[in-house]
């Protein structure tokens, strides 16, 4: 299927050189190297380790490999002054304080600079008050409080659990709220599976584990102080007033044995229904306030922490291309971690270093692929994407023209159970005929596919004998690329059982305890999950920086497509006397559906019978398969999230974790029953559906024969 | 590991006060409450009350309320139990427990007790 | 306060053989997260009381698996599979639903 002119190894053989060069032992050993002391963004530690992977990476055999420097806004815990949350009395003395710290775990008691929990961007300040418990803080969550048991939230503490949405849209909605400081805390229900034990023993979150983690809404914007261009030497620097996406109120996250001390004395309302409860031996009453005897206690904040402006460092490897230099198809995932990084990001790094270590064999053996393929190691993630996407807006001008893929590389595991992948549709066929190709690591499927595997455990909820490939969504790298830049994007890792485990992410998630040791004894002994892993990204990039032809699908669009068409439309009908008032018609949507449809169709029976030895047509019929994700930007961007630019995918939000479909559809159609004003609000419906359905004309378009 | 270890054995004449200690160790003290229980001779265990050295939160029970004191001192990692107006009938091996949190939420390390004779 | 009452009072045993030991609670033990907080701890002769096994199922550290809890509500059992010489003691069952209270005990003797 690969071949290449520019090779001495037999074309059949290349990727199957490539697999087999890459080594479980090998990911073992980096995983080691990059997570014995902490790499938190702008420190010299992880100044070091850029220096170091850069180094190997030359050693490797990369044609080039460059560090990106940029000056962008970081947040950091003051050292003499630590964050804490306080209950005081009446006579406001402090009679309970959360912890400075978790408790290191075995082994590194002696490592210095582990930076204490604190919520990344949270602004100063000293609120006290009554206690509001708002459960995740969902939107759902406070149109419950607010609309149904008439809780407001106005000048009160919000403590609310992590879990089902990112840490950031809970801060906003809480703001939104009217709250005046936010307590964010780990529940055992959502981060203590049943049977398991707590770390050291086990892999479960102990009660003085801590998630740490930005609470930024960049809504893509990248360095909040330098929205849409690079934070270069020359870039001219928002005030921080200005800048984007930083929460107004004071923000804080502790573990469930502190949360279980300010939980047990809630008043006020009982928690409305079952699925406010936790696992803590607390009522989780709502409030506003302490009970009885605890009536006159509040609770108080106190948080230092300092926004800075801090230079970071991306590594940029460059394998070039042997026949389309001038197509990019990018291997990218961050280095940057909260403390030792042992999952995130280390899993994933290691995973790239050994998939670069292999793509070097072979360039060494004489080999090179078709298409220039760049490796990232991206700095700065965990502080809100900045590194990846201040080299995209530097880069965005050969990007937009070059890109050909993004495939993103962090946490290679967060389970040990089956495959996930999130991607474009553009590239179902290939995972599926790459999983087809290659070993299940799982037991009991010894001897099949990894497709056969994971079908068996995810099942896709829409076509039988497939398994389930999620969209895209954000709290990732690969963001920039996509949402705004629109480059075919993908990401895959290894997964717990989503159904057996409702706990959120994985236990450790950002805490002290994501060490090496958690994933040696607990995750993967033999790092088998994580070869497999190595496999499914390092084979992605092979095939499409190798393939002759792009192996993207277009068809594959054109059947989500109606899927996302049919799910709006039904969402939009639960209010049938008002889309008959304001004449709502979704005729425009579903007619460039069938007319992409019909063109995908046509464009791939033309791929499949056109002549390949002509580089002319070749390059051609691959740009309209490398465009025609970019067809689908409006340059324009979603409302008030001018960095969201793809018509068809956004970051849901109410949760960047989660893709939306349709999103300038689905957002204008959120909640519309409360709007003040139903005529603007179903105008603006109407709008969106035009802007949709002419995207979705206009890409199916760049896909007709071009003259 | 986790221990807790008591003050030694005590002979009080009726009427008057006894203060038994106990020292943990092995954990960190504040985020788990103390318990303290009594078992007279070739008796069932009985709940006296439970301290909270996060936050001095006491709940005792009905029975001892007006003659229990439990107290901590957080710097020694030392809960201590006081009862007064003692009676022939307090004679009973006193026991400090910690009170495991989530996901235990029982008493999961005992100290080795306590023998408080009360005797004229 | 929360009445425990156990069931027998004195059981002897012959080592290998199965044991069984009943608690009742005068008032449900749901506690209103949903949790049961029933525990069951073993006191061996001239030993402090020992924690066994915690919300109603579950075996505490190092606990062998010959040891097993079960029951809902206000009825829950103990179960030892196969009894060995060194599981003679005083077993308690104990509630922390509601403020601590224990049964009175079942002292379990080799016959």
């Known amino acids: 299927k690969s071949s290449n002119e520019a090779t001495n190894i037999t074309p059949k053989h290349n990727m199957k050189a490539f697999l087999d060069e890459l080594k479980a032992e090998n990911i073992k050993k980096f995983l080691y190297n990059f997570t014995q002391i902490p790499h938190l963004a702008g420190t010299e530690q992880n100044f070091q380790l850029a220096k170091q992977i850069q180094s190997q990476w030359k050693e490797f055999g990369l044609d080039s490999v460059e560090l990106a420097h940029y000056d962008v806004l970081l947040s950091y815990p003051n050292k003499t002054h630590p964050n804490y949350i306080s209950i005081i009395n009446e006579d406001g003395n402090e009679i309970f304080n959360t912890s400075l710290f978790e408790p290191p775990p075995p082994g590194y008691e002696n490592v210095s600079d582990i930076v204490p929990p604190f919520s990344a961007f949270s602004p100063q300040g000293m609120p006290e008050g009554d206690l509001v418990y708002v459960n995740y803080a969902r939107t759902e969550d406070f149109f419950k409080l607010e609309r149904d048991m008439k809780i407001n939230c106005s000048g009160k503490i919000v403590i609310a659990r992590y879990g089902k949405v990112f840490r950031g849209n809970k801060v906003k909605n809480a703001q939104l709220a009217g709250a005046k400081g936010v307590i964010l805390y780990s529940d055992p229900a959502d981060y203590f599976a049943p049977g398991v034990k707590s770390y050291p023993d086990g892999w479960n979150l102990p009660g003085g584990g801590v998630q740490r983690g930005n609470i930024l809404n960049l809504n893509g914007a990248g360095d909040p102080l330098t929205p849409g261009y690079p934070a270069n030497e020359y870039a001219y620097r928002r005030g921080i007033a200005e800048a984007v996406g930083l929460p107004s109120i004071p923000v804080h996250p502790i573990g469930y044995y502190d949360a279980q001390k300010l939980l047990e004395k809630m008043g006020g309302s009982a928690p409305p229904d079952s699925s406010w409860r936790g696992s803590l031996k607390v009522p989780y009453n709502v409030g506003p306030g302490f009970t009885g005897n605890f009536s006159t206690q509040k609770v108080k904040m106190h948080i230092h922490s300092t926004n800075e402006v801090t230079r970071i460092y991306n590594v940029i490897g460059t394998l070039r291309g042997a026949v389309e230099p001038d197509r990019y198809v990018i291997l990218g995932g961050h280095r940057d971690s909260w403390v030792f990084g042992g999952i995130d990001p280390q899993s994933g790094a290691a995973v790239v270093h050994e998939i670069v270590r292999s793509f070097g064999t072979l360039k060494k053996e004489g080999w090179r692929p078709r298409r220039t393929i760049l490796f990232a190691s991206w700095d700065a993630e965990e502080f809100g994407l900045l590194g990846s996407t201040e080299w995209a807006e530097e880069n965005s001008r050969l990007l937009q023209e070059r890109g050909v893929a993004y495939i993103n590389a962090d946490s290679s595991i967060e389970g040990n159970y089956t495959l996930r992948v999130d991607c474009t549709p553009l590239m179902y066929s290939l995972v599926h005929n790459l999983t087809k190709e290659l070993k299940s690591p799982d037991e009991g499927f010894e001897g099949k596919s990894l497709y056969e595997s994971w079908t068996k455990k995810s099942p896709s909820p829409e076509f039988s004998g497939m398994p389930r490939i999620s969209k895209l969504g954000s709290g990732n790298d690969f963001e920039v690329f996509f949402q705004r830049l629109g480059i075919a994007s993908g990401r895959a890792r290894y997964t717990k059982n989503w159904e057996t485990n409702k706990f959120s992410g994985y236990p450790l998630y950002h805490s002290v305890y994501e060490t090496y040791e958690l994933v040696e004894k607990f995750y993967d002994p033999m790092f088998k999950y994580h070869l497999t892993v190595a496999q499914v990204r390092g084979g992605m990039v092979f095939e499409l920086a190798n393939s002759i032809v792009l192996p993207f699908d277009c068809r594959d669009y054109a059947v989500v497509l109606r899927k996302y068409a049919d799910k709006i439309y039904s969402i939009s009908m639960k209010h049938p006397q008002e889309m008959k008032t304001y004449s709502v018609s979704f005729d425009s949507l579903f007619s460039a559906v069938k007319n992409f449809t019909e063109i995908a169709s046509k464009f791939s029976e033309r791929l499949q019978d056109f002549d390949k030895s002509n580089p002319i047509v070749l390059r051609m019929m691959n740009d309209q398969l490398m465009f025609l994700e970019r067809a689908f930007i409006d340059p324009l961007g979603l409302p008030d999230r001018p960095f969201y630019r793809h018509v068809i995918y956004a970051p849901s939000s109410h949760n960047k974790y989660a893709g939306e479909s349709f999103p300038g559809i689905y957002d204008a159609l959120f909640d519309i029953e409360s709007k003040v004003d139903p005529s603007k609000a179903w105008g603006e419906v109407k709008r969106q559906i035009y802007v949709a359905a002419f995207t979705v004309q206009a890409a199916a378009e760049t896909l007709s024969e071009v003259a | 590991q986790v221990q807790l270890v008591q003050s030694g054995a005590e002979v009080k004449k009726p009427g008057a006060s006894v203060k038994v200690s106990c020292k943990a160790s092995?954990?960190?003290?504040?985020?788990?409450?103390i318990n303290w229980l009594r078992q007279a001779p070739g008796q069932g265990l009985e709940w006296m009350g439970g301290?909270?050295?996060?936050?001095?939160?006491?709940n005792y029970a009905q029975k001892f309320q007006g003659r229990v004191t439990l107290t901590i001192d957080t710097s020694t990692s030392t809960a201590y139990m006081e009862l007064s107006s003692l009676r022939s009938e307090d004679t009973a091996v006193y026991y400090c427990?910690?009170?495991?949190?989530?996901?235990?939420?029982?008493?999961?390390?005992w100290g080795q007790g306590t023998l408080v004779t009360v005797s004229s | 306060d929360i009445v425990m009452t156990q069931s027998p009072l004195s059981l002897p045993v012959t080592p290998g053989e199965p044991a069984s030991i009943s608690c009742r609670s005068s008032?449900?033990?749901?506690?209103?997260?949903?949790?049961?907080?029933l525990h069951w701890y073993l006191q061996k002769p001239g030993q402090s009381p020992q924690l066994l096994i915690y919300?109603?199922?579950n075996r505490f550290s190092g606990v062998p698996d010959r040891f097993s809890g079960s029951g809902s509500g206000t009825d829950f059992t103990l179960k030892i599979s196969r009894v060995e010489a060194e599981d003679v003691g005083v077993y308690y069952c104990?509630?922390?639903?509601?403020?601590?209270?224990f049964g009175g005990g079942t002292k379990v003797e080799i016959k």
């Open positions: 919300t109603v199922s």
């Open positions: 301290i909270s050295p996060g936050d001095g939160n006491v």
């Open positions: 104990s509630q922390s639903t509601h403020v601590p209270t």
């Open positions: 092995g954990y960190t003290f504040t985020y788990f409450d």
């Open positions: 427990a910690r009170d495991g949190n989530f996901p235990y939420y029982a008493m999961d390390s």
């Open positions: 008032q449900s033990l749901v506690h209103s997260n949903g949790q049961t907080y």
